[in-house]
Amino acid sequence: EEELQVIQPEKSVSVAAGESATLNCTATSLIPVGPIQWFRGVGPGRELIYHQKEGHFPRVTPVSDPTKRNNMDFSIRISNITPADAGTYYCVKFRKGSPDVELKSGAGTELSVRAKPSAPVVSGPAVRATAEHTVSFTCESHGFSPRDITLKWFKNGNELSDFQTNVDPAGKSVSYSIRSTARVVLTRRDVHSQVICEVAHVTLQGDPLRGTANLSEAIRVPPFLEFTQQSMRADNQVNVTCQVMKFYPQRLQLTWLENGNVSRTEMASALPENKDGTYNWTSWLLVNVSAHRDDVKLTCQVEHDGQPAVNKSFSVKVSAHPKEQGSNTAAENTGTNERGSSDYKDDDDKHHHHHH
């Protein structure tokens, strides 16, 4: 009779996580009698995976009935494979004894586990930034194997090139993680923009995973301020409007000051959205000219999204005339946009106002 050989025909086997792995092993002889054992790894620290003679191995099933006569097929099937099962498996023949004596090992079969990456999670900056600034977005995905993976960034469908990607760990592992940081230059038109992180991996059958982040979470578009004044009404009142335009997000507080005194404070709410995702807001102030002897300096003070206040001032000229006469009043837009903060004092009952 020929000398026993233990044959493991496959050098490597690749299996998707969750599936079963079949590890093939045949012996060339029934002699000597004795059990087959399967191990992962070699040396004293090797892990027993299956013992034909004894033990309970709930995930392992012999492919051939071990009680079958003339059985020389010692292949096993391992169910519900996870990345932790990766490694090299050895089919080892033992000679019957007390204890059994190791006789011959197969050459080993390397089991690699194809595990899908987790859905990419994209996170943006902790604080908002304004147009022309560069912000960083991070994309993370975990638990994939093998290590080879492709990650791309897109902004509104256009591929980005300014990003850095790391796959960890650098050495051999049962599974890997990827982390990529992309730098994106903001524009005022980016409220509706989206960044997409796209991950392609062998386990995804050409259908990449995507994670998205809305630039609306990262951008701040500061407002433009504009004054307009309507001509004097018969009741000596002038309607002055402060237009707050093209801002995002909606969080905005507007304060009217008359000669430096707070006249009214308003909070923006439930504003209609512009096509580009920004908001406009108009506030009116009725100035009772007859209540003033001198020119009135009006200031529209806007605090947007917790940023320092932006001021726009405007002078309403009060002509010298008897109060009862309906005389013309000149108004002048000073055109100043000032940044600075004010003390807010609600003085709403000083004048009659009409506002939206």
Epitope: E1, L30, I31, V33, H51, K53, P66, T67, N71, K96
Partner: antibody, heavy 119, light 110 residues
């Protein structure tokens, strides 16, 4: 350490039945055949039958096919051999034996159960 | 059915001498490249013990003075140098089909 522990001696009347048990330990019970062999006093070995505990497949010696029944209880790793319609010439030591190599051989043996059939 | 016939029925050999027991099958027991013959030793009051499997392979723990040989229909168990503890009845068994035993050979010391 493979061990096969058999039930105690039995005395039966002709025509009765006997059920001998064999409790296995030290190995995976369902992975190996169990054989039953008997030996009448001063006589040779006579193979009765064998059973695969994994699926209860059985093979019987034609001589015993109608009178012997082999069963197993995998939850307790115990094999049973029942012999019916006992006659005086069924008086023998009944052995269970495990087939370690699936070669239809008998590698490990119980110590035997003496069944005496006498009126 | 295959019938096994052992010879002699009994045998007396001096300590240290060679003992030879034969087993003849009524038809060949060779199949799949193996000779399906096994040899057992049974001492008084004990169950049998497997000595040789597949005609020529010593079971674990069996002293190397025991050897098996033969092919097809004729097989031999040899004890090269008889020891006192070898006194027993020896049986051959085949499993070419369902198992049967030879009638046994009683070995004694001369």
């Amino acid at each position: 350490q493979v061990q096969l522990v058999q039930s105690g001696a039995e005395v039966k009347k002709p025509g009765a039945s006997v059920k001998v048990s064999c409790k296995a330990s030290g190995y995976t019970f369902t992975n190996y055949w169990i054989n039953w062999v008997r030996q009448a006093p001063g006589q040779g070995l006579e193979w009765i039958a064998m059973i695969d505990p994994s699926d209860s497949e059985t093979h019987y010696n034609q001589i015993f096919k109608d009178r012997a029944t082999l069963t197993t209880d995998t939850s307790t790793s115990t094999a049973y051999m029942e012999l019916r319609s006992l006659r005086s010439d069924d008086t023998a030591v009944y052995y269970c034996a495990m087939d370690y190599g699936s070669l239809y051989a008998m590698d490990y043996w119980g110590r035997g159960t003496l069944v005496t059939v006498s009126s | 059915d295959i019938v096994l016939t052992q010879s002699p029925d009994s045998l007396a050999v001096s300590l240290g001498e060679r003992a030879t027991i034969n087993c003849r099958a009524s038809q060949s027991v060779r199949s799949s490249g193996y000779n399906w013959i096994f040899w057992y030793q049974q001492k008084p009051g004990q169950p049998p013990k497997l000595l040789i499997y597949l005609a020529s392979n010593r079971d674990s723990g069996v002293p190397d003075r025991f050897s098996g040989s033969g092919s097809g229909t004729d097989f031999t168990l040899t004890i090269s140098s008889l020891q006192a503890e070898d006194v027993a009845v020896y049986y051959c068994q085949h499993s070419r089909e369902l198992p049967t035993f030879g009638q046994g050979t009683k070995l004694e010391i001369k």
